[in-house]
Interface confidence: medium
């Protein structure tokens, strides 16, 4: 959530508001046909993950959602920091990123939107 927005901890800069509170900071927003949205929020204790999910509505049209999440099927051991993958039919989700570091769900896949729309087709 939007506590005059989010912060990361610098070694030389640790006010009490940064101490003893390891809740993750994520972006929480939704957009059509683009991954470009940002809305920094601190997640609840019960939501330790950031996610981006892209959902195909119909060919060449998708909606992305950036959220805090209580769980993450995409996290694997022994590399818990992040996993991205594309999902095939018949699942409507065709891109998912799940991660645990501050603002880690800001960016989507490393391909441009038009290429991504082609994939969504």
């Amino acid at each position: 959530h939007l506590n005059l927005t989010a912060r990361q901890q610098d070694p030389e800069d640790t006010p009490q508001t940064d101490e003893g509170d390891d809740r993750v900071w994520c972006h929480v927003c939704e957009r059509e046909n683009t991954f470009e949205c940002e809305n920094p929020r601190r997640c609840q204790w019960t939501e330790p993950y950031c996610v981006i999910a892209a959902v195909k509505i119909f060919p060449r049209f998708f909606i992305i959602s950036k959220q805090c999440s209580a769980s993450c099927a995409a996290i694997e051991i022994p590399k818990p920091e992040e996993k991205r993958f594309l999902l095939e039919e018949p699942l409507p989700f065709f891109y998912l990123k799940c991660c645990k570091t501050r603002y880690c769900n800001l960016q989507g896949p490393a391909i441009n939107t038009s290429s991504f729309k082609e994939y969504a087709g």
Partner: antibody, heavy 114, light 107 residues
Framework: QVQLVQSGAEVKKPGASVKVSCKAS????????MHWVRQAPGTGLDWMGW????????NYAQKFQGRVTMTRDTSISTVYMELSRLRSDDTALYYC???????WGQGTLVTVSS | DIQMTQSPTSLSTSVGDRVTITCQAS??????LNWYQLKPGKAPKLLIY???NLERGVTSRFSGSGSGTDFTFTISSLQPEDIATYYC?????????FGQGTRLEIK
């Protein structure tokens, strides 16, 4: 230590624009969102919007939409707030505030008067 | 927009008094609430964050409680230096909004 230093007081005529700067030091500038808040005489605090010094992304309060522009210059760790089409009721103290609200600039008084 | 209704708007009080200010949100904001102190010519000072956490360096005379829509800010024993205007602020959703403020005066 963290410091936010704002530009000096401004006197403007109605219809003009004003650009207030906020120079940050003592922390990683691109790691923290910056907000602008104003306080008009005899009124409360009014949130204007935020800017991401990292991406340059912005989010403005509806009441300032179309009149406010927030920008940043990462090379000098400075954010700017420009307010256009000034009216007399824009006379206020303008503050930059880092993220959580535990660090604020000293405020910049903008007076709009004909 | 989330409306923050703060009361009272002003309070005449005496040194040593217990002071209570309330803030009501127009919808559930969890615990996403700050309390600020504002003195003339000075920048706002964060006192309480996340509704009940005392910011470092802030006197323990100040405390906050509440969650959801109803919040309370308390000064256990008012001191002369506490004379100021106090604001609540929600940061659950944009736009960030403030209460209208509570001005403390000495009787």
């Amino acid at each position: 230590q963290v410091q936010l230093v704002q530009s000096g007081a401004e006197v403007k005529k109605p219809g003009a624009s004003v650009k207030v700067s906020c120079k940050a030091s003592g922390y990683t500038f691109t790691g923290y969102y910056m907000h602008w808040v104003r306080q008009a005489p005899g009124t409360g605090l009014d949130w204007m919007g935020w800017i991401s010094p990292n991406s340059g992304g912005t989010n403005y309060a509806q009441k300032f939409q179309g009149r406010v522009t927030m920008t940043r210059d990462t090379s000098i760790s400075t954010v700017y707030m420009e307010l256009s089409r000034l009216r007399s009721d824009d006379t206020a103290l303008y503050y930059c505030a880092r993220e959580v609200g535990n660090y604020w600039g000293q405020g910049t008084l903008v007076t709009v008067s004909s | 927009d989330i409306q923050m209704t703060q009361s009272p708007t002003s309070l005449s009080t005496s040194v040593g008094d217990r002071v209570t200010i309330t803030c009501q949100a127009s919808q559930d904001i969890y615990n996403y609430l700050n309390w600020y102190q504002l003195k003339p010519g000075k920048a706002p000072k964060l006192l309480i964050y996340d509704a009940s956490n005392l910011e470092r360096g802030v006197t323990s005379r100040f405390s906050g409680s509440g969650s959801g829509t109803d919040f309370t800010f308390t000064i256990s024993s008012l001191q002369p230096e506490d004379i100021a205007t106090y604001y609540c602020q929600q940061y659950d959703s944009l736009p960030i909004t403030f209460g209208q403020g509570t001005r403390l005066e000495i009787k």
